[in-house]
């Protein structure tokens, strides 16, 4: 059966069989800026690039033992939740990965900084169709990891991030807090935002819409064929990233505020229980959930 | 994300080092009444004191952005202090990544075509 | 073939009710958004309301606000506007219309049924 | 008063190419796509240009469509007399409504 979490971003009466939208995102190109990846894995293989960036610090402790599986767990798990062929959101959607994060997650904003400007750089030198990145991490609020974002936004890119697991206001992180980048919290398959051990989603103003980010079922990097369910605003963002991804390959043209109305249009909303956030947060936190729009093969029909 | 509000900084710590003009060898003076400022992560233990991002005014140059973080080894090598530019950006942002000693910071605030400092800073995986 | 044929259309007397109806055919209309869009004779199109596939969200134009109300029957492919307290201005042509959703348009339209509000 | 605005009427001998003009503000037309319905006389609007500048199938490549900022434009090469119709620009509101222009007249000389 079809994972909860596709059956929640799929609207009703879809059969599992049947989820194949427009061309898959394969006119758009989706740069993870992440952990190392299994490229060769069975979800993504042929899917994924593996780009020659790394720009990552030292793992933290004197016995830290690298071991691929582990380096590479939260980067597979996102690339397959993005255009996985199992699992994926846009199935046709061809991604490149950049390796910021080190095999403890961890990363810098200067090492960030340089995988964005190899992005734009990237794109410069090969203009392609439309460009997603995802951002699936977070630090505390950059001002120069937020200008670099609206910069690339006015590139013409389409920047999604993650919101944040601190249950906190994701206005205090970044790149959760650009303006021009689309912040994704996480909820679950009831609609309760998600808790993450004693922490949980972040939400605010600076969110934009949640997407399912718990018991998300993925590619693991245990084996090329392995699955792993793993939970965050890492993998609400890869949600939103793929269905970007879809819509951008039926509009190629469409600007980042016209794809944000339609993120929004098509989104459920007012299902998420607000309990859940503080009650001053409660009116500027978004209650909208991410969804595709409702039809699967379809050109515009003209009478 | 969220389009629209105002860009705040939260409890984002700016420590503005105002320019004193006895600093000495500037080819070029800063902008009259314009205060480059330092920026460091709010969350202490995600601080990565050491490494700095220099970003300069929009319009700047690579050439000049090579030729300011020259200055600044320069400058900082007459008062006996190692530094090591990591990465000129251009591109995205105009700037350099540098790591130097915290104590050069007012030194490298004074520099023509800064416009602000950034300490670099910690981002983990979500 | 994708139809979309309206009917209900009448004379009423203003402060009077009637309910349109339109009736899709041709493809899956639990997937569409639905509009009704109204012209009045000789003027340009108005958007009169619409209504999420699921039925889940239903949006109007001010001036029939807490007048008109948009509903659907998914089972049954179709889509109604009850209208109530009309009046001389809500005289038009209403038209039933379907919204694209990858190219957010309305790309299918009925040929209209005319609702005329006099005394 | 339409919340788009167009020019009431336009005209052009065959042949010939012709724009219509459609502006809008920060809130439809300036975050949302432009779309373009053609209406025959005494028949039901049909679409034209969708996504600012798309053609559904079957619609001929001499209508196109652009935009910029908060206005957008449809241009007709080579007229034909079939073109004489109505034309209205469209698009949705971040008020959750979507809204017309209130329709050009084309006549073909």
């Known amino acids: 059966s079809i994972p909860w979490n596709l059956e929640r971003i799929t609207p009703p009466r879809y059969r599992a069989d049947e989820y194949q939208p427009p061309d898959g995102g394969s006119l758009v190109e989706v740069y993870l800026l992440d952990t190392s990846i299994q490229s060769d894995h069975r979800e993504i293989e042929g899917r994924v690039m593996v780009t020659d960036f790394e720009n990552v610090p030292e793992e933290d402790g004197t016995r830290f033992h690298r071991q691929a599986s582990k380096c590479d767990s939260h980067g597979t798990h996102l690339a397959g939740v993005v255009s996985g062929r199992d699992a994926g959101v846009a199935k046709g959607a061809s991604m490149r990965s950049l390796r910021v994060l080190n095999c403890q997650g961890k990363g810098t904003v200067s090492g960030t900084l340089i995988g964005l400007e190899f992005i734009r750089k990237s794109q410069l030198v090969q203009p392609v169709g439309p460009l997603v990145v995802l951002l699936p991490l977070a630090g505390g609020y950059s001002r120069v990891l937020n200008a670099a974002c609206q910069r690339l936004a006015r590139a013409g890119v389409v920047l999604v991030t993650a919101a944040g697991n601190f249950r906190d206001d994701a206005c205090l992180y970044s790149p959760a807090s650009a303006p021009e980048v689309i912040t994704v919290g996480a909820t679950n398959a009831q609609d309760q935002p998600v808790t993450l051990g004693t922490l949980g989603t972040n939400f605010g103003r600076c969110v934009d819409l949640f997407a399912p980010g718990e018991d998300i079922i993925g590619a693991s990097s245990d084996c090329s064929t392995c699955f792993v369910s793993q939970s965050g605003t890492s993998q609400a963002a890869a949600h939103v990233a793929g269905i970007a991804a879809m819509m951008l390959s039926a509009e190629p043209e469409l600007t980042l505020a016209e794809l944000r109305q339609r993120l929004i249009h098509f989104s459920a909303k007012d299902v998420i229980n607000e309990a859940w956030f503080p009650e001053d947060q409660r009116v500027l936190t978004p209650n909208l959930v991410a969804a595709l729009p409702p039809s699967t093969h379809e050109n515009l029909y003209f009478q | 994300g969220a389009m629209g509000q105002e860009d705040e900084d939260g409890d984002y710590e700016e420590l503005v080092l105002a320019l004193r003009s006895e600093e000495d060898g500037l080819a070029e003076a800063p902008e009259h009444g314009t205060t480059a400022t330092f920026h460091r992560c709010a969350k202490d233990p995600w601080r990565l004191p050491g490494t700095y991002v220099v970003v300069l005014k929009e319009e700047t140059h690579l050439s000049q952005s090579e030729r300011t973080a020259r200055r600044l080894q320069a400058q900082a090598a007459r008062r006996g202090y190692l530094t090591k530019i990591l990465h000129v950006f251009h591109g995205l942002l105009p700037g350099f990544l540098v790591k130097m000693s915290g104590d050069l910071l007012e030194l490298a605030l004074k520099l023509p075509h800064v416009d602000y400092i950034e300490e670099d800073s910690s981002v983990f995986a979500q | 073939e994708v139809q979309l044929v309206e009917s209900g259309g009448g004379l009423v007397q203003p402060g009077g009710s009637l309910r349109l109806s339109c009736a899709a055919s041709g493809f899956t209309f639990s997937r569409y958004w639905m509009s009704w869009v109204r012209q009045a004779p000789g003027k340009g199109l108005e958007w009169v309301a619409n209504i999420k596939h699921d039925g889940s969200e239903k949006y109007y134009v001010d001036s029939v606000k807490g007048r008109f109300t948009i509903s659907r029957d998914n089972a049954k492919n179709s889509l109604y506007l009850q209208m109530n307290s009309l009046r001389a201005e809500d005289t038009a042509v209403y038209y039933c219309?379907?919204?694209?959703?990858?190219?957010?348009?309305?790309?299918?339209w009925g040929h209209g049924t005319m609702v005329t509000v006099s005394s | 008063q339409s919340v788009l605005t167009q020019p009431p009427s336009a005209s052009g001998p065959p042949g010939q190419r012709v724009t219509i003009s459609c502006s809008g503000s920060?809130?439809?037309?300036?975050?949302?796509?432009v779309n373009w319905y053609q209406q025959l006389p005494g028949t039901a609007p049909k679409l034209l240009i969708y996504s600012n500048n798309r053609r559904p199938s079957g619609v001929p490549d001499r209508f196109s469509g652009s935009k910029s900022g908060t206005s957008a434009s449809l241009a007709i090469s080579g007229l034909q007399s079939e073109d004489e119709a109505d034309y209205y620009c469209?698009?949705?509101?971040?008020?959750?409504?979507?809204?017309f222009g209130g329709g050009t007249k084309l006549t073909v000389l």
């Open positions: 469209a698009a949705w509101d971040d008020s959750l409504n979507w809204v």
């Open positions: 219309a379907r919204e694209s959703n990858w190219g957010f348009a309305f790309d299918v």
């Open positions: 920060s809130s439809n037309i300036g975050s949302n796509t």
